[in-house]
């Protein structure tokens, strides 16, 4: 069971990153999902190696006092959402903005029907050229 | 089937990095080969998790404007060299250069035969202290 | 074998950073332990993807000339320390501090007894927030 | 069901100019990497350029590089490819292809003739 999915820019002013099976994807089989473009959903219940990378373009004077955070968070059914990992990155003092990459990865079980998906503190600041950022999954 | 090779400074000007089974290096078996000090090529078709991480020395004022970019790149028999992922850093302000550190990681599907290699924009300005800068991948 | 600790904040002037089984953590059986809180210590040899994730948050000014650096270190029984894989991020020169985040990863061959553990240049801007900092490994 | 049409073909002289068009159609076109590939009279394929999903990257055989352009229009579900300076070893069938490497597999269409002749 693996799946890597690829960024995809999103009008919606939501937080949560947008993906698709586009490009070089990889989705093993239906033991693995991408739900509403948002969320990957597995069926089987056990230990998953999760990880996501974030291109971003900020600067510091046009950005927020805090830094730009990534973070990968997990949905279990019945649960709160909580979160599995997070990176931070102050942003560059380039101009127009300094590009920075994050890369996020951990070891965790997983219930049938939990969805992993990625938050960024500001999304039109993700890069979405090819390679740039990108999802995925396999279990152990 | 795994394999984690280690950089090496190369006088060549290609801006493909150069890899060498040395220090604490892996390589599981021969299906899995590095060839010419440049690429790991696999045997088997299958589903591979592939990581390189670079760590680089830049200066804003010494570099060019364009961020220092990392590649993960596939070339498959009588396919063309494409790129799987990217990372790109803007340049530091410090002086005489600023050390940052990219990790790149996805699963993908390789066909027989298939090879992947790391490109950067500016191989002078790669740190090639130990444990710095490798490149790997894991069949899954 | 997989585990997932959680980075802990430490009253040590220790550079080793120090880890607990709290939050969202993995320990999938007693192959694979956490000792003294600062090390991961592998009952069976084989191969093994190890990774940490380091955030921290400096500033150029109030920090020394030299990066910021996070190890992932060895140990096995009857052998020198030694260094797997290390990062380096030059200081922010944000105020007060600038957050940053590291990423490690790679697979290695690991003896009976060995133990894994990470080291950092100073451990007192290590970022302990949720999901900021862990550590962890897989048997392949 | 996959439909590419590709047309923009014809004669033309050494040194001339040509731009092919595809027009595709029974797939999300712009998930998809998407290239042009020829094969001269009695020779085998020959992957002549693809580009990315988002058009930001393309590649090129050493053949072609620096004559010919690839390019695409996600909103009009067309791919191009603008060919300068050609000689008469790019006289060749060409056709457009859905680049698909999982699975391992790719569409073509049915070919517009290139023939590059004084």
């Known amino acids: 069971i693996a799946a890597h999915v690829i960024s995809e820019a999103s009008s919606k002013t939501t937080s949560v990153l947008q993906w698709a099976e586009k490009g070089y994807y990889t989705m093993s089989n239906n033991l693995v999902t991408l739900e509403n473009g948002k969320q990957l959903t597995v069926k089987r219940q056990g230990l998953y190696y999760i990880y996501a990378q974030v291109t971003f373009c900020s600067n510091r004077e046009a950005s927020s006092q805090a830094p730009f955070i990534a973070s990968l968070c997990l949905k279990s059914p019945g649960r709160f959402e909580r979160i599995l990992l997070r990176a931070a990155n102050t942003h560059s003092s380039a101009k127009p903005c300094g590009q920075q990459s994050i890369h996020l990865g951990g070891v965790f079980e997983l219930q049938p029907g939990a969805s992993v998906f990625v938050n960024v503190t500001d999304p039109s600041q993700v890069s979405h050229g090819t390679g740039f950022t990108s999802f995925g999954l396999l279990k152990l | 089937i795994a394999a984690h090779v280690i950089s090496e400074a190369s006088s060549k000007t290609t801006s493909v990095l150069q890899w060498a089974e040395k220090g604490y290096y892996t390589m599981s078996n021969n299906l899995v080969t590095l060839e010419n000090g440049k690429q790991l090529t696999v045997k088997r078709q299958g589903l591979y998790y592939i990581y390189a991480q670079v760590t680089f020395c830049s200066n804003r004022e010494a570099s060019s404007q364009a961020p220092f970019i990392a590649s993960l790149c596939l070339k498959s028999p009588g396919r063309f060299e494409r790129i799987l992922l990217r990372a790109a850093n803007t340049h530091s302000s410090a002086k005489p250069c600023g050390q940052q550190s990219i990790h790149l990681g996805g699963v993908f599907e390789l066909q027989p035969g298939a090879s992947v290699f790391v490109n950067v924009t500016d191989p002078s300005q790669v740190s090639h202290g130990t444990g710095f800068t490798s490149f790997g991948l894991l069949k899954l | 074998i997989a585990a997932h600790v959680i980075s802990e904040a430490s009253s040590k002037t220790t550079s080793v950073l120090q880890w607990a089984e709290k939050g969202y953590y993995t320990m999938s059986n007693n192959l694979v332990t956490l000792e003294n809180g600062k090390q991961l210590t592998v009952k069976r040899q084989g191969l093994y993807y190890i990774y940490a994730q380091v955030t921290f948050c400096s500033n150029r000014e109030a920090s020394s000339q030299a990066p910021f650096i996070a190890s992932l270190c060895l140990k096995s029984p009857g052998r020198f320390e030694r260094i797997l894989l290390r990062a380096a991020n030059t200081h922010s020169s944000a105020k007060p501090c600038g957050q940053q985040s590291i990423h490690l990863g790679g697979v290695f061959e690991l003896q009976p007894g060995a133990s894994v553990f990470v080291n950092v240049t100073d451990p007192s801007q290590v970022s302990h927030g949720t999901g900021f900092t862990s550590f962890g490994l897989l048997k392949l | 069901e996959v439909q590419l049409l590709e047309s923009g073909g014809g004669l033309v002289q050494p040194g001339g100019s040509l731009r092919l068009s595809c027009a595709a159609s029974?797939?999300?076109?712009?998930?998809?990497?998407m290239g042009w590939v020829r094969q001269a009279p009695g020779k085998g394929l020959e992957w002549v350029s693809m580009i990315e999903p988002a058009g930001d990257l393309t590649y090129y055989a050493d053949s072609v590089k620096g004559r010919f352009t690839i390019s695409r229009d996600n909103s009009k579900n067309t791919l191009y490819l603008q060919m300068n300076s050609l000689r008469a070893e790019d006289t060749a069938v060409y056709y457009c292809a859905k680049y698909q490497e999982q699975p391992w597999f790719d569409y073509w269409g049915q070919g517009t003739l290139v023939t590059v002749s004084s």
């Open positions: 029974g797939f999300t076109f712009q998930m998809y990497p």
